[in-house]
């Protein structure tokens, strides 16, 4: 055996954003023939020796970072990329608005603003159909998400969440959807 065993993949189905009391399944997938898996919840000292963790009803205590590995012979694989399992609906939903408005001409500018009555310092913006939130450092975790030089690809349904950096895996309920329409 030369070099470390390749890392497995870890995914949350149907999504890593899980409303409280809703089900989610974490699945660790390594190469064919591997059956010894360890799934860890980081910063909690806990682990289980199974590739699949079924959570029938999401709880606050289950939110956090997860990672998995597998053992082949006496060798351990590299760890999977960390999966951030987020509990949503912990706090009331924020409001999402578009400035100057939700209808914008192609080539124009628009800013999506996420507002909450709580003193949260973190915000995430999701576009329906995208696998992940906007993670561009300039737009990530901000109350304002400017979209410069709008194109047709920006059309769609947006939602935002708010949360605190002290509890980064406990999020609000999603805002009501905002439909961004790109004309021309």
């Amino acid at each position: 055996q030369s070099g470390p065993l390749p890392k497995p993949s870890l995914q949350a189905l149907p999504s890593s954003l899980v409303p409280l009391e809703k089900p989610v399944t974490l699945r660790c997938q390594g190469p064919p023939g591997v059956d010894l898996y360890r799934l860890e919840k980081l910063s909690s000292s806990r682990y289980q020796d199974q590739a699949v963790l079924f959570i029938p009803a999401m709880k606050r205590s289950l939110a956090g970072r997860y990672r998995c590995s597998y053992q082949n012979g006496s060798l351990w694989s590299l760890p999977s990329d960390q999966l951030e399992l987020v509990a949503t609906g912990v706090f009331a939903k924020p409001s999402l608005s578009a400035q100057p408005g939700p209808a914008v001409s192609s080539g124009g500018d628009v800013t999506l603003q996420c507002q909450t009555r709580y003193g949260f310092d973190q915000f995430a913006l999701y576009k329906e159909g995208d696998p992940a939130p906007y993670k561009n450092p300039e737009r990530w975790y901000r109350a304002s998400f400017p979209i410069i030089t709008v194109t047709a690809a920006h059309s769609g349904t947006y939602r935002c969440y708010s949360f605190s950096s002290r509890d980064p895996y406990l999020w609000s309920a999603p805002s009501d959807p905002l439909e961004l329409v790109v004309t021309g």
């Epitope: 360890r38 000292s45 020796d49 590995s69 006496s74």
Partner: antibody, heavy 123, light 112 residues
Framework: QVQLVESGGGLVKPGGSLRLSCAAS????????MSWIRQAPGKGLEWVSS????????DYAASVKGRFTISRDNAKNSLYLQMNSLRAEDTAVYYC????????????????WGQGTLVTVSS | QSVLTQPPSVSGAPGQRVTISCTGS?????????VHWYQQLPGTAPKLLIY???NRPSGVPDRFSGSKSGTSASLAITGLQAEDEADYYC???????????FGGGTKLTVLG
């Protein structure tokens, strides 16, 4: 109450073998990871080996890999450590320790320890 | 050479506060693994003192507290008592080969 009792220690010559046992009682043995941890005279603690609750996951410290073999018999509530090719530096008190468990989760710490059994490797 | 680094000894007078540090690396404490502390009184087996960085098992006085930050952790003992004289060990897990790791131990001496 939880009890872990080690046995099998003694004096052995370098290159010799010894088998340690740990008898567990007062808890559901088959639910818990178990480990062997040793302490050389006047020195600190060194983790030696661990075995998963079903005996599948097995890990060793680099210092004993290939010489020591951990095993368990859940029907007998017993943990074992077969030590071969013993060296002077293996001289230590060997502790059997239980890993904490809660519901489906195992934890990376030891909530109960036995009193230990002394292994002396000397010619 | 232990994977986790602790001072060999600390001391304090009765009633005082002492702290014991435990320094690891990005593959253990810094990799998201918690730190646990054990107390070993002279001639006895180690006993779990703090688990999950800062939690006390039942029966452990609240004079003992733990914390973790980045790749290090510390154990604090306030209102030092003669019976606290013991060896203290930190422990974590290491991601490299999934091994359990200990600090070298710290001998606490209660003066006077």
């Amino acid at each position: 109450q939880v009890q872990l009792v080690e046995s099998g220690g003694g004096l052995v010559k370098p290159g010799g073998s010894l088998r340690l046992s740990c008898a567990a009682s007062g808890f559901s043995f088959s639910d818990h990871y178990m480990s062997w941890i040793r302490q050389a005279p006047g020195k600190g603690l060194e983790w030696v080996s661990s075995v998963g609750s079903e005996g599948k996951f097995i890990d060793y410290a680099a210092s004993v890999k290939g010489r020591f073999t951990i095993s368990r018999d859940n029907a007998k509530n017993s943990l074992y450590l077969q030590m071969n090719s013993l060296r002077a530096e293996d001289t230590a008190v060997y502790y059997c320790a239980r890993h904490y468990r809660e519901f489906r989760w195992h934890y990376y710490y030891f909530d109960y320890w036995g009193q230990g059994t002394l292994v002396t490797v000397s010619s | 050479q232990s994977v986790l680094t602790q001072p060999p000894s600390v001391s304090g007078a009765p009633g005082q506060r002492v702290t014991i540090s435990c320094t690891g690396s990005s593959s253990n404490i810094g990799a998201g693994y918690d730190v646990h502390w054990y107390q070993q009184l002279p001639g006895t087996a180690p006993k779990l003192l703090i688990y999950g960085n800062s939690n006390r098992p039942s029966g452990v006085p609240d004079r003992f507290s733990g914390s973790k930050s980045g790749t290090s952790a510390s154990l604090a003992i306030t209102g030092l008592q003669a019976e606290d004289e013991a060896d203290y060990y930190c422990q974590s897990h290491d991601l490299g080969a999934h091994v359990w790791v200990f600090g070298g131990g710290t001998k606490l001496t209660v003066l006077g």
